[in-house]
Interface confidence: low
């Protein structure tokens, strides 16, 4: 019995759902009563999910797995793994037994994007050319371990006097801290790039140091120019910093985070104390960093409804404010493809191919193409429906007249994450086949 799985690892973002594809070729007359299916961890043989005696025996893996019961009879033994964790990474074996039996192992590679790095400077005032400064670049909650690169304003790599440490938290996600020691010139820009080697995702930040600027006395509040992109269900840091004057103490600080449009209070710090969250108890400051001018806000368990602009307002003697945009995103699931009618197909028949992808945000862009990569634009109807959480389910329907045979591919693109989810179906007269992933 030939059991097919993707050759390449399945890459899944922490907190999202992953599909471990597995298929077998049922013989004529096959019924589910004959099927014995086991998913297990390859190394330890720990049972993950099983199907026997015509029934789904359920998840043995923290109730986070599911089969696709409607597709089993067609030979689709794929496993859905929900709310992926770092600890899920590894090899899963799909074992199928009917009369004959076979198995194949598919690798799950877990990944989490690194946050935009925050940069701190020590010392951060009264700087003169020739001074030695320590620049720290910190990026949070990524996986796997990052590669960190430093460069100057001309793009020349800085490799000397760099110390990088990476520490995993309880969830196995890494916080990266890289320290660069440099001797200041007249002025200079120093850039830090944190690269996720699996996602090929680069997070950049830079700091420009102009020694001995004349003090203005104004509170300059700085936030990222670009929107902060956060995945649904993860935590986001809305960066905000100000320049404390010499002799500044927290007793002088008044800090308010609020929604820019409605002025709804989100979080505040006054009279030397954190006044707490006014936003569903999902926000926190970084109390140990406030005295250094770091007024950033941590927003936990991000929801679609959080999307929008947040204002960071700082008042000491002088005051200032700046607004940072939060862009929420959720990756779309790998599309499932259905065919109607799905048997006794002949060239010249009109068939309806439906491509469905779930729980993404924001609305997707959907593209169809044939086996030669030629776009198919006619007779396509796409609908997108938001659920209670604001996540979109996408259903795109293509009506085609069959040739002798043909492959039809559907691509669901998340425009914010630049994430593409592909599905395809190959129709060869009869029967139809779902090709394994490349």
């Amino acid at each position: 019995l030939e059991v097919q799985v993707p050759e390449d690892p399945v890459v899944a973002l922490v907190g999202t759902d992953a599909t471990l594809c597995c298929s077998f070729s049922p013989e004529p007359g096959f019924s589910l009563a004959q099927l014995n299916l086991i998913w297990q961890l390859t190394d330890t043989k720990q049972l993950v999910h099983s199907f026997a005696e015509g029934q789904d025996q359920g998840s043995a893996y923290a109730n986070r797995t599911a089969l696709f019961p409607d597709l089993l009879a067609q030979g689709n033994a794929s496993l859905r793994l929900q709310r992926v964790r770092v600890a899920d990474e590894g090899s899963f074996t799909c074992f199928v037994s009917i009369r004959d039996f076979g198995s194949a192992a598919v690798s799950l590679q877990v990944a989490a994007p690194y946050s935009k790095p925050s940069m701190t400077l020590e010392p951060n005032k009264d700087l003169r050319p020739g001074d030695t400064v320590t620049i720290t670049c910190s990026s949070y909650q990524g996986y796997p371990e990052a590669e960190v690169f430093w460069q100057d304003g001309q793009g020349v790599p800085l490799t000397g006097n760099v110390t990088t440490s990476q520490m995993a938290n309880e969830q196995g996600l890494f916080d990266v801290h890289s320290i660069l020691r440099v001797v200041l010139g007249a002025n200079g820009t120093y850039s830090c790039l944190v690269r996720n080697p699996v996602l090929q995702q680069d997070a950049h930040s830079s700091v420009t140091i102009t020694p001995q600027r004349s003090p203005t006395g104004a509170v300059e509040v700085q936030v990222p120019e670009d929107p902060v992109v956060a995945l649904v269900g993860t935590d986001a840091t809305l960066r905000c910093s100000f320049s404390p004057e010499p002799g500044f103490s927290l007793a002088q600080l008044n800090l308010i985070w609020q929604l820019t449009d409605t002025k709804q209070l989100v979080h505040s710090f006054t009279e030397g104390r954190d006044q707490g969250s006014a936003y569903a108890n999902r926000t926190a400051l970084f109390p140990d960093l406030l005295a250094q001018g770091n007024a950033s806000l941590r927003l936990q368990r991000v929801r679609v409804a959080d999307e929008g602009s947040f204002t960071c307002f700082v008042s000491i003697r002088d005051f200032g404010s700046a607004a940072v945009s939060l862009q929420v995103a959720a990756p779309y699931s790998k599309p499932s493809m259905t065919l109607e009618p799905n048997k006794d197909l002949r060239p010249g028949d009109t068939v309806t191919i439906t491509c469905s992808s779930y729980r993404g945000y924001p609305e997707a862009e959907v593209f169809w193409q044939d086996g030669q990569g030629v776009p198919l634009t006619g007779n396509v109807t796409t609908s997108q429906m938001a659920n209670e959480q604001g996540l979109f389910d996408v259903h795109s329907v293509l009506r085609v007249v069959l040739g002798a045979n043909g492959t039809y591919s559907c691509l669901v693109r998340n425009p914010v994450l630049q994430q593409d989810a592909h599905g395809s179906v190959t129709i060869t007269g009869q029967p139809m086949t779902f090709p394994p992933e490349a």
Epitope: F149, Q151, G155, P157, L193, P197, Q200, D202, Q418
Partner: nanobody
């Protein structure tokens, strides 16, 4: 200028940035035709992407220490005659010209029958 069936290697050297941070691509434009995608290579060289009709004959590679990307072309045919460009990739699909931020001036390759 090469003969039908010959091989050729093109080189493209970049300067002024952190070469190893950028994916690179190759395109070509035949006389009277639109510019078309040939191949692309990821920043560290681990991933490559080819136009369907060129995979197998054409191979792209890179040497980040030399800030150089290469296009190895085998079994050349007269229809491969074109100006070949290398480009630095920004955001987007590798096969789309709009995804590329910086372009070389191009080099003429002529394949004689």
């Amino acid at each position: 200028l090469v003969q039908d069936g010959d091989s050729l290697r093109l080189s493209c050297k970049a300067s002024g940035g952190t070469f190893s941070s950028y994916a690179m691509g190759w395109f070509r434009q035949a006389p009277g035709q639109e510019r078309e995608f040939v191949a692309a290579i990821s920043s560290e060289g681990g991933s490559t992407y080819y136009a369907d009709n060129m995979e197998g004959r054409f191979t792209t590679s890179r040497d980040n220490a030399k800030n150089t990307v290469y296009l190895q072309m085998n079994s050349l045919k007269p229809e491969d005659t074109a100006v070949y460009y290398c480009a630095v990739k920004g955001v987007g699909w590798p096969q789309e010209q709009a995804s590329y931020d910086y372009w070389g001036q191009g080099t003429q390759v002529t394949v004689k029958p």
